[in-house]
């Protein structure tokens, strides 16, 4: 099985009440604008076939996609939360920059690609949905990486 290295985040990243609250507030505001409740981006399908030791690497991919392809294009919306949450998530992404797995990661890339395709297919409403799931992104990152 692939071995992951440097795929760890310090628990203290998730023990900051202020930024945690802002992240959840941003998610709540965006999810109230999401009218497609049948689709969930961060759920069982995303992690299917991914071992415990690979979960953080997968979440790194999801985090980077969310930052680059979702939050930056929508950066003028959902203020003032967005301007505080984006730098926080960017710091987490930077902390995971050396996280990789040795060996085949094709199964992980396939799962992440399905999430990307879903967001792209839904267009702007897909981006809103992804922002509405930032609470799940935050918690999944925490659970996979600490």
């Amino acid at each position: 099985a692939p071995v992951s290295s440097h795929c760890r985040l310090d628990k203290s990243n998730f023990q900051q009440p202020y930024i945690t609250n802002r992240t959840f507030m941003l998610a709540k505001e965006a999810s109230s604008a999401d009218n497609n409740t049948d689709v969930r981006l961060i759920g069982e399908k995303l992690f299917r076939g991914v071992s415990m030791s690979e979960r953080c690497y997968l979440m790194k991919q999801v985090l980077n996609f969310t930052l680059e392809e979702v939050l930056l294009p929508q950066s003028d919306r959902f203020q003032p939360y967005m301007q505080e949450v984006v730098p926080f998530l960017a710091r987490l992404s930077n902390s995971l920059s050396t996280c990789h797995i040795e060996g085949d990661d094709l199964h992980i890339q396939k799962n992440v690609q399905k999430l990307k395709d879903t967001v792209k297919k839904l267009g702007e409403s897909g981006e809103i949905k992804a922002i509405g799931e930032l609470d799940l992104l935050f918690m999944s990152l925490r659970n996979a990486c600490i």
């Epitope: 099985a1 069982e44 299917r48 991914v50 071992s51 918690m139 659970n143």
Partner: antibody, heavy 116, light 112 residues
Framework: QSVEESGGRLVTPGTPLTLTCTVS????????MIWVRQAPGEGLEWIGI?????STYYASWAKGRFTISRTSTTVDLKITSPTTGDTATYFC?????????????WGPGTLVTVSS | AVVLTQTASPVSAPVGGTVTIKCQAS??????LAWYQQKPGQPPKLLIY???TLASGVPSRFKGSGSGTEFTLTISDLECADAATYYC??????????????FGGGTEVVVK
């Protein structure tokens, strides 16, 4: 998608016993599996888990007392040296990670009685 | 290891009534909490995860809430079929895997 346990029976203390969990409708290459037990009239107690890559993790109290292994369609739980305190219904369940681990579905359970 | 303390059994209410079951964690578990229903002679059944997300096929009469150390399962419009024992279950990450999954002691619900 279902799981079913088998192999539970009456055994004497110290006699090793292997329970088998057979899965259908999904692949063990996609999901981790857990074992949980429940003594008569008591609550649920996590024993251990076997991951997709075959890695195993046990509750601290269960280390050395149980061994989990698997084939392509079954997951085994070996009780290495049963004592009367191991009398319980043993359940296996699929671990669905959705960002947090959740256990669904569960098998109906298999009863192990340890008595001299 | 985290300890989950549930409302003492039994909790009773009439058909059509409401019951509330509490689950207290000995440390902060964020929203890493699930609820399971178990009827006599049957395996547990997943009801709620992420503290408040309803599992597939579970009626909206079941509602989970809470985060951190205090969690609640509320069952409204009680039916006879809701008579069961309810368990909370926590996932704790970042520590040793030997204490990752913990169950509460269970709370029996009696429907009168």
């Amino acid at each position: 998608q279902s799981v079913e346990e088998s192999g539970g029976r009456l055994v004497t203390p110290g006699t090793p016993l292997t329970l088998t969990c057979t899965v259908s409708g999904f692949s063990l290459s996609s999901y981790a599996m857990i074992w949980v037990r429940q003594a008569p009239g008591e609550g649920l107690e996590w024993i251990g888990i076997i991951d997709i890559d075959g890695s195993t993790y046990y509750a601290s109290w269960a280390k050395g007392r149980f061994t989990i292994s698997r084939t392509s369609t079954t997951v085994d739980l070996k009780i290495t040296s049963p004592t009367t305190g191991d009398t319980a219904t043993y359940f296996c369940a699929r671990d669905r990670f959705v960002g947090v681990d959740i256990f669904d579905p569960w098998g109906p359970g298999t009863l192990v009685t340890v008595s001299s | 290891a985290v300890v989950l303390t549930q409302t003492a059994s039994p909790v009773s209410a009439p058909v059509g009534g409401t019951v509330t079951i509490k689950c207290q964690a000995s440390e902060d578990i964020y929203t890493n909490l699930a609820w399971y229903q178990q009827k006599p002679g049957q395996p547990p059944k997943l009801l709620i995860y992420w503290a408040s997300t309803l599992a597939s096929g579970v009626p909206s009469r079941f509602k989970g809430s809470g985060s951190g150390t205090e969690f609640t399962l509320t069952i409204s419009d009680l039916e006879c079929a809701d008579a069961a024992t309810y368990y909370c279950q926590a996932c704790v990450y970042g520590n040793s895997a030997d204490s990752r999954y913990t169950f509460g002691g269970g709370t029996e619900v009696v429907v009168k």
